[in-house]
């Protein structure tokens, strides 16, 4: 019986070039967390394993930092980072719990002003 629930940061927005923390929290279960996977669409971003600690996928090493906690920090954001992110908790004996976060990366206000006004 899966009694747990995942609370996430929900729908969030951040500025291009900035950073954002993706956070999930599993509650209402005594199940043992063996691993947390962070995924974006079909891509694995990072893993936090109970035995081995953190592993960041090589293609994201430059822009992804582990933590805080079981969360994930995305850095140097681009508009291409806009989309769905999933935290997947592997637990025993419950199985997998999945949380969803939607991130929208906005053009920074500086960039917008720069495009709108020409500096003489």
């Amino acid at each position: 019986m899966m009694t747990g629930t995942i609370e996430t940061t929900g729908n969030i927005s951040a500025e291009k070039g900035g950073s954002i923390i993706l956070q999930c929290h599993l509650s209402s279960t005594t199940a043992q967390v063996t691993q947390v996977n962070w995924e974006q669409q079909d891509q694995l971003l990072a893993i936090c394993n109970a035995d081995l600690g953190w592993h960041i996928s090589p293609s994201f090493k430059d822009r992804v930092a582990p933590g805080p906690g079981l969360g994930l920090t995305l850095q140097s954001l681009t508009v291409n980072d806009t989309g769905e992110y999933f935290c997947i908790y592997h637990t025993y004996p419950d199985g997998t719990y999945t949380g969803r976060i939607f991130l929208e990366v906005l053009e920074s206000s500086v960039a917008e002003h720069g495009a709108r006004f020409q500096i003489p």
């Epitope: 691993q35 996977n37 035995d51």
Partner: antibody, heavy 119, light 107 residues
Framework: EVQLVESGGALVKPGGSLKLSCAAS????????MSWVRQTPEKRLEWVAT????????YYPDSVKGRFTISRDNAKNTLYLQMSSLRSEDTALYYC????????????WGQGTSVTVSS | DFQMTQTTSSLSASLGDRVTISCRSS??????LNWYQQKPDGTVKLLIY???RLHSGVPSRFSGSGSGTDYSLTISNLEREDIATYFC?????????FGGGTKLEIK
């Protein structure tokens, strides 16, 4: 090349004990969770046990809990399954497999070792 | 426990055929569905994980689809080396249960 080679299968009497081994090579054994899966004479596959990469966590279905113990020696690249209080329904071909949590699947399997429980 | 059912226990097809093998779970498994191939000599290989993702080295003629409780494995152009028994397995919740298998034979 990933290789998993099981050994230790035998004919044992009901109530008896047996220890299976699985020698791993071709990958960093200590980085992966491992599992035992068995195939019954009726050809059904059943998950038997899983152990985390460092050996800190072990998991079993109710059918073997308290009778089977999965363990590993990362220095020897070897996985074990200690089976006790064996029953006729434990008769099966026992496979060891690498359990990849990033795939949610067992990505490599050995060739199996046969266990027969009969008087 | 999640029950996995493969209603077709054996299937006969001709070389070059398109073959579909079905699997149903007793509860929603959120696409945590894997397919394994067992050759007549007992060798087991992972073909597809998470419903549709091809494992490394698996020919592209294999594909998977489905959602919720209904899943399928398709072989688009049957080759002699595909003669085997195919098992589905749910990876969502322990115990990680398997279907009963579908044995594929050549007509």
């Amino acid at each position: 090349e990933v290789q998993l080679v099981e050994s230790g299968g035998a004919l044992v009497k009901p109530g008896g004990s047996l220890k299976l081994s699985c020698a791993a090579s071709g990958f960093t054994f200590s980085n992966y969770a491992m599992s035992w899966v068995r195939q019954t004479p009726e050809k059904r596959l059943e998950w038997v046990a899983t152990i985390s990469s460092g050996g800190s966590y072990t998991y079993y279905p109710d059918s073997v809990k308290g009778r089977f113990t999965i363990s590993r020696d990362n220095a020897k690249n070897t996985l074990y399954l200690q089976m006790s209080s064996l029953r006729s329904e434990d008769t099966a071909l026992y496979y060891c497999a690498r359990w990849l949590l990033s795939l949610y699947a067992m990505d490599y399997w050995g060739q199996g070792t046969s266990v027969t429980v009969s008087s | 426990d999640f029950q996995m059912t493969q209603t077709t226990s054996s299937l006969s097809a001709s070389l070059g055929d398109r073959v579909t093998i079905s699997c149903r779970s007793s509860q929603d498994i959120s696409n945590y569905l894997n397919w394994y191939q067992q050759k007549p000599d007992g060798t087991v290989k992972l073909l597809i994980y998470r419903t549709s993702r091809l494992h490394s080295g698996v020919p592209s003629r294999f594909s998977g689809s489905g959602s919720g409780t209904d899943y399928s494995l398709t072989i688009s152009n049957l080759e002699r080396e595909d003669i085997a028994t195919y098992f589905c397995q749910q990876g969502k919740t322990p115990p990680y249960t398997f279907g009963g298998g579908t044995k594929l034979e050549i007509k």
